[in-house]
């Protein structure tokens, strides 16, 4: 990805998805009526013109927000602590990798706008998730809906990272 982002970053992202999957506590079949449109900003991860700074910023903010969401008293009460600790550790490692990378990308002169804009959009999205959890009184079903939503958005963000990686590979081989 044009910086010292380790090859295992993609693996860490997949591990995060696996952990989120394992964290399931109740059957999602019981929670259909609690579905909500959180309006994940798809346009942010679907574009074909991927800038390194944009991808790094989206991933960094996503992981930062997931870390914050699952690093609260409410979250500790809702989830298996062993899995939660593993999630925190994995997210912390990924954030460290990305921060190193972001510093280099900024140093290479990529625009600050490409970094600040996705961050603001994602903060609004996660604020909507927090409001929903509060509104639903942090019920098991509310957490289950949020877990599934985060798996979906993280999956889309990881896909964006893979697309940039393969684009870089194509450029490197041509």
């Amino acid at each position: 990805l044009g910086c010292d982002l380790p090859q295992n970053h993609g693996l860490l992202s997949r591990n995060t998805l696996v952990l989120l999957h394992q964290m399931r506590r109740i059957s999602p079949f019981l929670c259909l009526k609690d579905r909500r449109d959180f309006r994940f900003p798809q346009e942010m991860v679907k574009g074909s013109q991927l800038q390194k700074a944009h991808v790094m910023s989206v991933l960094h903010e996503m992981l930062q927000q997931i870390f914050s969401l699952f690093h609260t008293e409410r979250s500790s009460a809702a989830w298996n602590m062993t899995l939660l600790d593993q999630l925190h550790t994995g997210l912390h490692q990924q954030l460290q990798h990305l921060e190193t990378c972001l510093l280099q990308v900024v140093g290479e002169g990529e625009s600050a706008g490409a970094i600040s804009s996705p961050a603001l959009t994602l903060r609004r999205y996660f604020q909507g998730i927090r409001v929903y959890l509060k509104e639903k009184k942090y019920s098991d079903c509310a957490w289950e809906v949020v877990r599934m939503e985060i798996m979906k958005s993280l999956f889309l963000s990881t896909n964006m990272q893979e697309r940039l990686r393969s684009k870089d590979r194509d450029l490197g081989s041509s």
Epitope: H21, R24, S27, P28, F29, C31, L32, K33, D34, R35, R36, D37, F38, E144, V145, M148, E149, K152, F155
Partner: antibody, heavy 121, light 107 residues
Framework: EVQLVQSGAEVKKPGESLKISCKGS????????IGWVRQMPGKGLEWMGI????????AYSPSFQGQVTISADKSISTAYLQWSSLKASDTAMYYC??????????????WGQGTLVTVSS | DIQMTQSPSSLSASVGDRVTITCRAS??????LNWYQQKPGKAPKLLIY???SLQSGVPSRFSGSGSGTDFTLTISSLQPEDFATYYC?????????FGQGTKVEIK
């Protein structure tokens, strides 16, 4: 392109067993649930049950509980509907369809082409 | 289980007519209601989801409304390809349930 491709038509005798399939492609198979729907000749749609292929969690309509078994093999992106002992009244068209689970997206947006099951002595 | 009741069970109409089909749930299902169209020998096709959202690729003459227990599917100007059977389905809670269907025939 998203596709659900079902196995071909079956002609069976009462008391025989049967397993029909529904193969998903063009999307992340474990990110969607697969539902099964029955349509008896000249009748309406009846919801049978659903499976989450990511962990094979299932739920059935009370009318079909104990009558059929729904399963999935995520390694080959395929869901199954099976009977251990068919009856003449199982004669119908069976459809599979994908469901987005708890994600906010269209329900049952893609359907298989249907599998016609005929049970006759 | 939630019962879904559609009316009418069949109707005759002409090309260009405005057609309305109603669906009533035995208890509140919020906006978790879908409408499907089915033609003979074909799989059902999703038209409307979450009561009023038009599925991608479906003509804008189809619209849905309602919430709670009472829902409506409207075809603003019936086209020859719209003669089919229409089903409502609730996805608020399992088991999902369908209405009995409304057959739209040519007058």
């Amino acid at each position: 392109e998203v596709q659900l491709v079902q196995s071909g038509a079956e002609v069976k005798k009462p008391g025989e067993s049967l397993k029909i399939s529904c193969k998903g492609s063009g999307y992340s198979f474990t990110s969607y649930w697969i539902g099964w729907v029955r349509q008896m000749p000249g009748k309406g749609l009846e919801w049978m049950g659903i499976i989450d292929p990511s962990d094979s969690d299932t739920a059935y309509s009370p009318s079909f509980q104990g009558q059929v078994t729904i399963s999935a093999d995520k390694s080959i992106s395929t869901a199954y509907l099976q009977w251990s002992s068919l009856k003449a009244s199982d004669t119908a068209m069976y459809y599979c369809a994908r469901h987005p689970g708890l994600n906010w997206a269209p329900d049952f947006d893609y359907w298989g082409q249907g599998t016609l099951v005929t049970v006759s002595s | 289980d939630i019962q879904m009741t559609q009316s009418p069970s069949s109707l005759s109409a002409s090309v260009g007519d405005r057609v309305t089909i109603t669906c009533r749930a035995s208890q509140s299902i919020s906006k978790f209601l879908n409408w499907y169209q089915q033609k003979p020998g074909k799989a059902p096709k999703l038209l409307i989801y979450f009561a009023s959202s038009l599925q991608s690729g479906v003509p804008s003459r189809f619209s849905g409304s309602g919430s709670g227990t009472d829902f409506t599917l409207t075809i603003s100007s019936l086209q020859p390809e719209d003669f089919a059977t229409y089903y409502c389905q609730q996805s608020n809670t399992l088991p999902f349930t369908f209405g009995q269907g409304t057959k739209v025939e040519i007058k």
